[in-house]
Each structure stands twice: as C-alpha cells, then as structure tokens.
Amino acid sequence: PSLIKQQVLKNVRIDPSSLSFNMWKEIPIPFYLSVYFFDVMNPSEILKGEKPQVRERGPYVYREFRHKSNITFNNNDTVSFLEYRTFQFQPSKSHGSESDYIVMPNILVLGAAVMMENKPMTLKLIMTLAFTTLGERAFMNRTVGEIMWGYKDPLVNLINKYFPGMFPFKDKFGLFAELNNSDSGLFTVFTGVQNISRIHLVDKWNGLSKVDFWHSDQCNMINGTSGQMWPPFMTPESSLEFYSPEACRSMKLMYKESGVFEGIPTYRFVAPKTLFANGSIYPPNEGFCPCLESGIQNVSTCRFSAPLFLSHPHFLNADPVLAEAVTGLHPNQEAHSLFLDIHPVTGIPMNCSVKLQLSLYMKSVAGIGQTGKIEPVVLPLLWFAESGAMEGETLHTFYTQLVLMPKVMHY
C-alpha cells in the first residue's frame, strides 16, 4: 500500500513528468452539454395575469471541448492557466435541431423591468417608449441556436449606449455566448509538488483570493478546486468543493455512497439539500441573499444585475411553491439531481453529471407597459446537464494502472 501511495502521489500532481499531467491539461473525457428549454405555451395569457404553462424541449446536445492554455508554473507551488471551451452541436444525440423555435421570456425586457422597478417613473416610461420603438415584447420566439449563442437585438446596443458598462454583451445577446470560445477566468491552483494535501486547490481566480459578489466573507470565499480533479485519498468524510465561475461562488458536494464504475471503485458525491437553501433555512447562505423562496439562488449580482436565479432542474429540492407556480414542472430526483463519481484514491472523476437550471424572476412593473399584468413568478428558462464519463483508451490505462497493477503488486 505505501508503494501504491507513492505511485499515486507521484502521478497525480500537476507536473509535466506525472502520468496524469496530460490528462489534466487536455481532459480526455468526452464532455457533453445537454440543454433542455422551457417552451412557454401561453405568453398572451401570462401577460393577462394567468399562470405560466411550459413544455420541456430537448435535449439539445453539444460536445464540449476543453483545453488549457497559458499554463505558467509559479514559484509558490502553484500553476496558473486559462481553460477554453468550445461547443459543437451533436444532431444524432439531440432531440431536435438548433433551428427549432422556442417561445421564451425576453430577458432583456423583463430583466430590465425588474431592475428598474424602484427607479423614477419617468425612466420606466422612457424605457417603455424605447421598447415600443424597437418592437420589443415581453416574450420572444427565437431559435435554439439564437438563444444559445446570440441574436442581434437593437436593445443590446441601446443598453450599451445609455447604460454603459452594465452589460457584458457587445452586439449579440445569448445565454451561452460568453462560454463559447472563451475562458472561464485565470485559475491559479496548487500543483501538489511540494505539498500534496493542497493539490488542485484554488489559490486565486482572476488574481483574487475571494470574490465580492456576495454579502458575507464566507459566501465570497474561493474554496476547493477548479472542479476537475481533487486531492487524492478521499474518505467518506471528504467533501467535494469547487469554485464555479458560472455560479460566481464555491459549491460543496457531500459523499452519498460507494460504487463501481467500469470496474473502478468510486465515491458518489451529490448536492446537499442546503446548496441553494435561503438564509432563513440555512444561515450560512444568508450572504447570498436577498432571497426569494428557498432552493433558488439569486445570481443577479454577477449577471449584469438581471434577476436571474440558479437552482436544480424543475426546482428540485426547492420550496414546492416554485414548481407549483408554473404548469409543466415535474421535479424528479433521478432525472434532475447532479452527481460526481470520483475515484477516491486519486481524486479523479470517472463519471459525472452536473445539472443546473436558469430561471428569470418576472413581474408586472408599473410604468413599463410591456410587462402587462404578469403575476410575480420565477420562470424557468432552461436547464442543462454537463456530463462526462471516462471511456476507451483512457479508461483502460486508468484501470490497468490503478486497479490491476495494485492487485498484482498486492499478491
């Protein structure tokens, strides 16, 4: 066992001479992004104050390619890197095409309405006039491709012109536009060469030791790893913590059960019920508030102030009133909960599926005519699963090195 331990320690660290270095640099696991849209069935009725009715469409599946660049080894046992992602639509794995039309809330209009609720009435009336002039409505009918990667909207230019610096989009607006062909920030992580106990843990993200999106030091902490590998020699008492640039926060997953993936022993880690709980149910989350119902996290502070919320799909594990407020939602543990299966000896993921939902809080706002009589509701826009499983040559090598070899050496 000590020989095995030495081998593991030698080969998991981030070092060009270690066996796992290339695996860390160019993740050989095929990752897929599966996106499910909530097609709004009754937009006109919602504007009259009726309950929203949605139909889940999808999956629209994309192969996700990741590669690290600008890899720089620092002299404090850390390495800095940028990781770029590109997405390629997979028609054969998808239920529909990127040219499918989806009726969705117009995030720019309804988001701006809620953001301006407490602004002077005059400003809201000016926005109403601007929306009318530009032909903007509360709901839009756009293709999957447009929603994902961006569509030209005169409102984007208007926002950039009259509210400069507020908006990260320049010409087009798309929910995943910022992710494609771009990096998720400069990560600086510990290599484990000098101190294995800190391997993969994030030292800094974009040069920051903590973020300032939230209202408490605890919520602003950058904890855990960058979400791809963890320190070796895990136990059932270990937790799986990582910083997610997309959620603008650190997340902690808990051990659920032991299992086996393609002959390799694994630990399954899942989201605790408290992950998106509000501050009154789970006080450490108070820093993420102001909160609505429990089970959804307000990410407006890191998403151009738009009233966007992150949760489990179909409001799984959230306050039941959220799913009850929208017809067509059916939360299901099996289908909608996220998991990561980790090989505990190395801290390397074997099989994972991270599932999250993005929703928009919308309501009627006096002075903004486009919002009609919309009753306040958190309306799901889409949910996605980012999934990957080790396979092929990589799996064979891993199995040989970490399962067969130790068995042979044991005898």
Epitope: N118, K119, P120, M121, T122, L123, L125, I126, M127, L129, A130, L158, K161, Y162, F163, P164, G367
Partner: antibody, heavy 116, light 110 residues
Framework: QLQLQESGPGLVRPSETLSLTCNVS????????WSWIRQSPGKGLEWIGN???????DYSPSLKSRLRMSVDTSTNQFSLRLSSVTAADTAVYFC??????????WGQGTLVTVSS | QSVLTQPPSASGTPGQRVTISCSGS????????VNWYQQLPGTAPKLLIY???QRPSGVPDRFSGSKSGTSASLAISGLQSEDEADYFC???????????FGGGTKLTVL
C-alpha cells in the same frame, strides 16, 4: 420639424395659480415624454416634472404638493398648474421633450413673474 | 442649492482646452449617466452630451464628456468665441427620484 411653444400669463399674483400650456408640433405627443423645467433669474435650471400621454406624471418632490400637470392628446398640448405661488416661483419656464438621451428639444421659454 | 456641484465660472483663450467638472454622489452620478447642456445667452438650453460621452448629431467633436465614479467632466478643445455660454450637467437622482441639474458654469472666452 419638432417645435415646442409655451404660452400663458407673464404675471401672476402671490398665492394664486400659475398656468402654462405647451403646444407640440411636428410630432405626436404620444411618442415621447414631456417636461417642464424652470430657471430663476440669473440662476440654474430646476426640473419641475414630466408627463406621459396616458396622464402618468412624475413630479419634483419639492413642488409635488402644489403641482398638477395634464395632457391633451387631441390638441397635442400639455399643461402645468402650480398653486399658491410666491416670489420664489418667478422664473423662465421651459417645456421640453424628454427621451432616453435627455431633454432633447426645448421651447424658447416664457418668463413668469410673481408679483402683486 | 444644487445637488450636483459645478464651478461657477471657467475661462480660456481661443484655441485652448477647457474642462468643466461636475460632482455628485452615489445616488445620482454614481448610479446614472450624465448629460450636459449648453445655454447660449438669451436662448433655451441645448443638449450637448448625453450618456456621459455621446454627442448628438450637429455637436462638434471639440466637445467631449467623461464620467468616473461620482464625478463627470466636460472638455472643450480648440475653444472658440461662440462657445461662450452657461454649461449645465444633469443626472437622474434615485433619492429625490427625479432629474437634477448642476448649478451651471459660466464659460468666458478671453
């Protein structure tokens, strides 16, 4: 060509009501927001309030209790009524068109003197 | 008393560059965009700069605006005699909930 023209009495007695009308030509009054701004002699500009064609108003907090604005879409005019005036209300009163850009078009202004 | 503070006067000789400042707070300039108005003697004000630094058509590019934090400034380069006027900054204010103006700066071309 958009034009705004203020009209109303140039002299108002203290404690009485100041009434002004702004005639809008060259554009429908329903297309924008309309404002009143005043400038006391030798002083800066002071925003009075805005009105939307539907009648929704937004008043300066300091004048709110004495102010009433109205709009008449049939004549393409909007009006201002300021009650219980004092010498401090003596000013040049401008009507203006308000867009996202700001006060984009102005009338030439009308001087209202409050004096007995 | 104006909520936005401007120097009462400024001056320069033809061809010079002059800057006029406008300072406010987080409830106005800090959370809004700034407009600048020019008022030539005996006339109504005219929109000169909107959204901090945008010029309406017809305004010469000698006029430029900028904003940083809770302050804004108007710069006039290549000063000309016809630039002699009063200049006012304006912004939305969230606390009194309306439009506020600066006290105005009288620009003299020497």
């Amino acid at each position: 060509q958009l034009q705004l023209q203020e009209s109303g009495p140039g002299l108002v007695r203290p404690s009485e009501t100041l009434s002004l009308t702004c005639n809008v030509s060259g554009v429908s009054i329903s297309d924008d927001l309309w404002s009143w701004i005043r400038q006391s002699p030798g002083k800066g500009l002071e925003w009075i309030g805005n009105i939307y064609y539907s009648g929704i108003t937004d008043y300066s907090p300091s004048l709110k209790s004495r102010l009433r604005m109205s709009v008449d879409t049939s004549t393409n005019q909007f009006s201002l009524r300021l009650s219980s005036v004092t010498a401090a209300d003596t000013a040049v009163y401008f009507c203006a068109r308000l867009t996202l850009r700001g006060f984009q078009n102005w009338g030439q202004g009308t001087l209202v003197t409050v004096s007995s | 008393q104006s909520v936005l503070t401007q120097p009462p006067s400024a001056s320069g000789t033809p061809g010079q560059r002059v800057t006029i400042s406008c300072s406010g707070s987080s409830s106005n300039i800090g959370s809004s965009t700034v407009n600048w108005y020019q008022q030539l003697p005996g006339t109504a004000p005219k929109l000169l700069i909107y959204s901090n630094n945008q010029r309406p058509s017809g305004v010469p590019d000698r006029f430029s605006g900028s904003k940083s934090g809770t302050s804004a400034s108007l710069a006039i380069s290549g000063l000309q005699s016809e630039d002699e006027a009063d200049y006012f900054c304006a912004a939305w204010d969230d606390s009194p909930n309306g439009v506020i103006f600066g006290g105005g700066t009288k620009l003299t071309v020497l």
